[in-house]
C-alpha cells in the first residue's frame, strides 16, 4: 500500500532509499522547457516478483517549446532560482550494489528529466538520512525512517538524527567516503 505522507523532514539533512519496494511510483517529471509525452504512464512503477523486480514504463520528455504554456502561472520564489543540473547517477554507486528481493534499484536517468525525483513509497520502505555538507550527524539511534501501517493508517517512524555544526557529511550505509556534492546528495535523489 502507498504511504500517505512523505518521509519526515530533518533540518539540514536529505534522505534516499537504497532500493525501492515493489509498488513504488516514480513520477515522470521533466525539467523546465520539457514535458512528459502524452502516451505512456505518468509514472514508473517498481514491479515484479520476489526473485526479480524492475521498473515498468519508461519516462520520456519532449520539448514544450512549440506548445502553448499557460501565462497565468506565477513561479514560486524557489523556482525562480537557477536549479543545478546534477547528473542523476553520478553519486549512486550504492544503488548499483544492492539486489534485494522484491526491490528495484535506482532507475537510470531519462533525457531531460527534472532535477528532483518524486517518489511515492509503499509500506515497508526504509529511507536513510544524511546531513548535508557542512553539518555533522548526532545520532541518538538509527538515521532512518520506515513507513509502517498502524491501525489502518500509514506513518513514518522518526529518524534519530540531528545535524549540527561544521564538518564532513555523514555516510549512508555501505558508502566508503563522504559525498562530493557541495550540497550532500543531489536534489534529484531526495523525495518529497
Amino acid at each position: 500500500e502507498l504511504c500517505d505522507d512523505d518521509p519526515p523532514k530533518i533540518t539540514h539533512a536529505t534522505f534516499k532509499a537504497v532500493a525501492y519496494k515493489e509498488g513504488t511510483m516514480l513520477n515522470c517529471e521533466c525539467k523546465r522547457g520539457f514535458r512528459r509525452i502524452k502516451s505512456g504512464s505518468p509514472y514508473m512503477l517498481c514491479t515484479g516478483n520476489s526473485s526479480h523486480s524492475s521498473w515498468d514504463n519508461q519516462c520520456q520528455c519532449t520539448s514544450s517549446a512549440a506548445r502553448n504554456t499557460t501565462k497565468q502561472v506565477t513561479p514560486q520564489p524557489e523556482e525562480q532560482k537557477e536549479r543545478k543540473t546534477t547528473e542523476m547517477q553520478s553519486q549512486m554507486q550504492l544503488a548499483d550494489q544492492v539486489s534485494l528481493p522484491g526491490h528495484c534499484r535506482e532507475p537510470p536517468p531519462w533525457e531531460n528529466e527534472a532535477t528532483e525525483r518524486i517518489y511515492h513509497f509503499v509500506v515497508g520502505q526504509t529511507v536513510y538520512y544524511q546531513c548535508v555538507q557542512g553539518y555533522r550527524a548526532l545520532h541518538r539511534g538509527p538515521a532512518e525512517s520506515v513507513c509502517k501501517m498502524t491501525h489502518g493508517k500509514t506513518r513514518w517512524t522518526q529518524p534519530q538524527l540531528i545535524c549540527t555544526g561544521e564538518t564532513e557529511p555523514s555516510q549512508f550505509p555501505g558508502e566508503e567516503e563522504p559525498q562530493a556534492s557541495p550540497d550532500g546528495l543531489p536534489e534529484s535523489e531526495t523525495s518529497r
Epitope: M25, G33, Y43, T47, D56, N57, T69, K71, E79
Partner: antibody
Amino acid sequence: QVQLQQSGAELVRPGTSVKISCKASGYTFTNYWLGWIKQRPGHGLEWIGDIYPGGGYTNYNEKFKGKATLTADTSSSTAYMQLSSLTSEDSAVYFCARVTPASWGQGTSLTVSS
Amino acid sequence: DIQMTQSQKFMSTSVGDRVSVTCKASQNVGTNVAWYQQKPGQSPKALIYSASYRYSGVPDRFTGSGSGTDFTLTISNVQSEDLAEYFCQQYNSYPYTFGGGTKLEIK
C-alpha cells in the same frame, strides 16, 4: 494529507462562461499534474484535460478544446477551469483530481439553464 | 481514444460473498489501469493503481488483477459499505478514459 477543495455549485445562463476553482493543500502543488473530469448521469466520467502548475503546461482532450481553459496560480496553489459558451450539455458535476497518486476534489455542480 | 468497457452495469451480491467487476480495454494498455469507488453523492475514491496495487487505507478485500486488455476488480467478503459504483480508468494514452461504471447492489 492531500486535499482538493473545489468552489461551490453554479447556476448560469446559456451562452455565458463560468470559472471553477480547485485549491490544493497537503502536497507541493507545482510538482504534480492536476486533471479535470466531467460527470453526467448516463454519460459516465470524461477526462477534460490536465495542467502542470510548475510550468503551466496543459493537455486537452480534443473533445473539450475550445470549451475548457485550464490555468493555475502557484501563489495560492489553486487551479482553475473556465468553461465558455455554455449550453445544457455542459450541465454536470466537475471534479479536479491530482493525476498520480490519484486524489479527487469533492466536485462542483454546474447547471446551465435559462 | 481507448474505450474502456464495463459490460455489467449492475451486479447484485450478498454480504460475505465474493464479486468480480470486469473491464475491457479496446487496445493494450499494459497495467496502466486504476479502479475507483464512487458512493452516492460523493467523489470517486481511488482503490487500485497499476492494475493490482492498493492505495493506502483500502481494505485488502479489494484486489485488482489483469494486464493488456482485460482487468478485474475482485471484492471478497463483500460488506454493506461496498454498495457503490465502480469505475476502471486507463492512463496508458491520452486522453485518459473511464469505463461506464458497474453499480454494486447488496441483496
